[in-house]
């Protein structure tokens, strides 16, 4: 039977806060966990998931995390379900709201000597307590003309008189913690003495040398005193004005008109009231100057035939906000249609060719107007003016493929080669009419070519193939130098193709035929046992008839290979002795003889004194150093051929003789001893 | 010995209602969950759905609305109530309790 | 709508022969290992051969072996014997008490 070890339990919990609900569970075999809230399975959140079979809740929320929670424990296999107890939570929360009027029903109806009622709109579990403030002073419960009722979370003021006008908010705490109203409420109950704004001056914006009129007006008992001032406090009357607001007049109203106005009459005034009793009141208004500045410049636009596109005035910054139309051909365009203007888009829906051309953008504001022109094309897909033709090129020469068309806007051509994308480099060139061309016919270059020419409305394609007509030339042209083997078997060989398959024969350069031991098979000239006498000049002549012949001049050198007489041995030196590599080489022409040591070939002219080739080919290295060891190589080589052999060298610390030693032991190693 | 036995198939016309009874003996079903599963003639398994030991009931989605699970624990019988049905619901009808435990089935058939 | 894929959907084999079958699923199952494997012959009840991914049932030779997490799973034959030929189906459990079969995968003789 499956038995639970731990089991859930109802507990408090906070708001926002981590939770755990335990379940452990002890079954003959696997079981698979899960819970189930109001009876419905519980799916993992990054905020409430399964933690092993307990389910732990990141940050408790007093709304998705309110029910009965159950742990649920099944064996598949067998299909038995056992059920936790039943847990809930008891989440403490507090949550902040606004001082609202409970009564009257609204502001309108607040006059003095009336009763008014505020809410405090701060909810919680447990109930918290409130506290009321005016102007952030707190008000106790006892105080008069005021009563508070914690249940119904209330304020209530009787009767309300200009003494209890103010600033309302509330404050509320609870064993989760404390909130304060998040909108307060303001409390104005009017003192007929006080002055109270019947009309308030509103922002100008004006264009310059216009008038402006700014309407002020307050009302009391007795009347209130009306006074206006500029931003720098200065007042403005009709006896005494400021130097810049020499054309002001102030009205009997209150009403204060500016005319003629300038930048420097621009700010703000101040149109300020006082009754017999209370504050002054200060209004604002501002003064503005009317601004327009440039429009930026439109791109110049393409659009296909047939789709709906937008343009996208921006208006340019200005005060008043500035009004924005399209014009085209000096019409203004409807507010609807197949092109019209919506907002501030221009809109071509449909698009046909005749859209084409310039639209204009106007923008106007009380500083004056301001416009842009946009160029519209309407992109047609290209036509063929001359498409690429086969065609046979010369191997060697330039070849060019056409691929003229036209269409608007100018259409961009592009090349293809067995598909794949020509880009241009040293041998390929795209010319501005879209013709290519190739700049040296290779045989390789004959293949399938592709052109494509596209406007943003399509595009066309045509394709041709080039077949190359190959010079007749040498694969590969022979060595104009080469070397026989005296007494051996050589070839030379000689190949070439052409349009035609030529014919390959060789000849010697004095015109004498060749001896009967020298065969020509197929352009490859054949020795059987090379003489001195088969020196000399020779040519390769290969022909057909359409194209004539070439001849390739070779001169054969007859040589006696490299061998060498004596070899460099491994050779080993006491440190400051002299060492001697010895190589000697022979060979038809006599080879000279090169030293490599350490990598590096030795210049008999900067060997120093240390160390000497002599004429045979030997090498001397007088008072060995450790760092002389390494291997060494004899190279030998004369005009046909090049052999080297190597050998190391090294070099020893000298022993000290020991008496056991007799004076005839020899070393250990082959040693040269100076 | 614990074992389940599937009874209440038959033939039924298009549009008509059949119940289908499934007896546990050995076992009471309070302590277990039960589940549905139908085979067509040539097809595959196709789960219908479950009672869990609360008597709460989950279902494929294709069985939503036609097919309701129900059991009466006094009797240890779950039962399988069709309506609506067509002629795509002929299948044997398993119950099975947990993955282990098969009944041998009983054929619906819903044809004219 | 949970979709469970069996592959292949019919294999032919030989006595001996190494058998692999997957099952993969359209969402993961419950847990990641919420998933069973039955064996079935024709006009019998199905058979529970693996239960939660990789336990083998009560009865069922151990050349019988599963593998797999969340939403891809094998059944393994590791040498084929002549009474396993039949069809093979994978079950996965889901979250909110929902249950699917795969299509069924028929092992036959080659």
């Known amino acids: 039977a499956i038995v639970f070890i731990k089991q859930p339990s109802s507990q408090d919990a906070l708001q926002g806060r981590r939770a755990l609900l335990r379940c452990e569970v002890e079954a003959p075999g696997p079981v698979h966990v899960y819970w189930l809230l109001d009876g419905a399975p519980v799916q993992d959140t990054e905020r409430r998931f399964a933690q092993g079979s307990s389910l732990s809740f990141a940050a408790v929320d007093r709304l998705q995390d309110s029910g009965t929670f159950q742990c649920v424990a099944r064996d598949d296999v067998t299909g038995e379900e056992a059920r936790s107890a039943n847990a809930s939570f008891n989440i403490k929360w507090i949550e902040a709201g606004p001082v609202v009027l409970k009564h009257p029903a609204s502001e309108a109806e607040i006059q003095p000597q009336t009763q008014v009622t505020l809410r405090c709109h701060i909810d919680g579990h447990p109930r918290p307590t409130y506290q009321w403030f005016r102007d952030g002073t707190p008000l106790s419960d006892g105080q008069s003309n005021h009563t508070v009722s914690s249940k119904e979370r209330n304020l209530t003021l009787r009767p309300a008189g200009p003494e209890h006008s103010g600033l309302y908010s509330c404050c509320a705490h609870s064993a989760f913690g404390q909130a304060c109203s998040s909108q307060n409420f303001t409390l104005s109950i009017a003192d007929e003495s006080f002055a109270r704004v019947v009309l308030a001056p509103q922002d100008v914006v004006v264009a310059r040398y216009e008038e402006a009129m700014f309407h002020c007006q307050f009302s009391a008992q007795p009347p209130p005193s009306l006074q206006w001032l500029f931003e720098d406090e200065t007042p403005i009357t009709n006896r005494s004005r400021p130097p810049h607001l020499r054309r002001a007049t102030v009205f009997a109203n209150g009403s204060l008109l500016l005319t003629q106005v300038r930048p420097r009459n621009a700010g703000i005034y101040r149109c300020i009231g006082q009754g017999q009793r209370g504050p002054p009141i200060i209004l604002e208004a501002t003064l503005h100057l009317a601004e327009i500045e440039d429009m930026p410049l439109f791109e110049p636009r393409v659009f296909t035939a047939g789709s709906e596109e937008r343009v996208t005035c921006l208006p340019p910054k200005g005060l008043p906000e500035p009004s924005v139309w399209w014009e085209h051909a000096g019409v203004r365009l409807p507010t609807h249609g197949r092109v019209y203007q919506k907002g501030h888009e221009l809109v071509l829906a449909n698009i046909a060719e005749s859209d084409a051309g310039v639209y204009t953008c106007h923008a106007a504001n009380l500083a004056g107007q301001r416009r842009q022109d946009v160029n519209i094309t309407v992109a047609t897909v290209p036509s063929w003016l001359k498409k690429p033709q086969d065609s046979q090129l010369e191997e060697g020469k330039p070849g060019y493929l056409d691929c003229l068309t036209q269409a608007t806007p100018k259409p961009t051509v592009v090349w293809y080669r067995n598909q794949m994308l020509i880009s241009e480099d040293s041998r390929f060139e795209v010319f501005k009419n879209g013709t290519l061309r190739i700049n040296s016919v290779e045989v390789y270059d004959g293949t399938w070519y592709r052109c494509m020419s596209s406007t943003p409305a399509g595009s066309i394609e045509a394709q041709a193939r080039v077949q190359v007509l190959e010079k007749l030339k040498f694969t590969p042209p022979p060595q104009p130098q080469q070397c026989m083997e005296f007494d051996k078997e050589a070839t030379v060989p000689c190949s070439a193709t052409g349009r035609e398959k030529p014919t390959i024969k060789w000849e010697r350069a004095d015109g004498s035929s060749l001896p009967e031991w020298v065969t020509d098979n197929a352009g490859t000239l054949h020795f059987a046992r090379v003489t001195r006498d088969d020196a000399g000049n020779y040519t390769c002549i290969a022909s057909n008839g359409p194209q004539g012949q070439i001849r390739a001049h070779v001169q054969l050198t007859v040589a006696v290979f490299i061998t060498f007489k004596v070899e460099p041995e491994r050779t080993t030196v006491y440190q400051g002795h002299t060492a001697l590599l010895q190589c000697e080489a022979q060979g038809d022409p006599k080879p000279l003889i090169q030293w490599k040591g350490k990598d590096r070939i030795l210049d008999p002219t900067k060997l120093g004194p240390r160390m000497h080739i002599f004429q045979n080919g030997s090498l001397v290295i007088h008072d060995v150093a450790p760092e002389d060891s390494g291997r060494y190589t004899c190279i030998a080589g004369n005009s046909c051929n090049i052999k080297h052999t190597e050998a190391p060298l090294y070099v020893v610390d000298k022993p000290v003789p020991e008496e056991s030693e007799g004076p005839g032991s020899p070393p250990p190693y082959k040693m040269i001893q100076t | 010995e614990v074992q389940l036995v599937e009874s209440g198939g038959g033939l039924v016309q298009p549009g008509g209602s059949l119940r289908l009874s499934c007896t546990a003996s050995?076992?009471?079903?309070?302590?277990?969950?039960m589940n549905w599963v139908r085979q067509a003639p040539g097809k595959g398994l196709e789960w219908v759905g479950i009672?869990?030991?609360?008597?709460?009931?989950y279902y494929a989605s294709w069985a939503k609305g036609r097919f309701t699970i129900s059991r009466d624990t006094s009797k240890n019988t779950v039962y399988l109530q069709m309506n609506s049905l067509r002629a795509e619901d002929t299948a044997v009808y398993f119950c099975a309790r947990g993955l282990y435990l098969w009944g041998q089935g009983t054929l619906v058939t819903v044809s004219s | 709508e949970i979709v469970m894929t069996q592959s292949p959907s019919t294999l032919s084999a030989s006595v001996g022969d190494r058998v692999i079958i997957t099952c993969q699923s359209s969402?993961?199952?419950?847990?990641?290992?919420?998933l069973a494997w039955y064996q079935q012959k024709p006009g019998k009840a199905p058979k529970l051969l693996i239960y939660?991914?990789?336990n083998l049932a009560s009865g069922v030779p151990s050349r019988f072996s599963g593998s797999g997490s969340g939403a891809e799973f094998t059944l393994t034959i590791s040498s084929l014997q002549p009474d396993d030929f039949a069809t093979y189906y994978c079950q996965g459990g889901y979250h909110g008490n929902i249950y699917a079969f795969g299509q069924g995968t028929k092992l036959t003789v080659l």
């Open positions: 969402q993961s199952v419950y847990n990641n290992n919420l």
């Open positions: 009672i869990d030991s609360s008597g709460s009931t």
């Open positions: 050995g076992f009471s079903l309070s302590n277990y969950v």
């Open positions: 939660y991914t990789s």
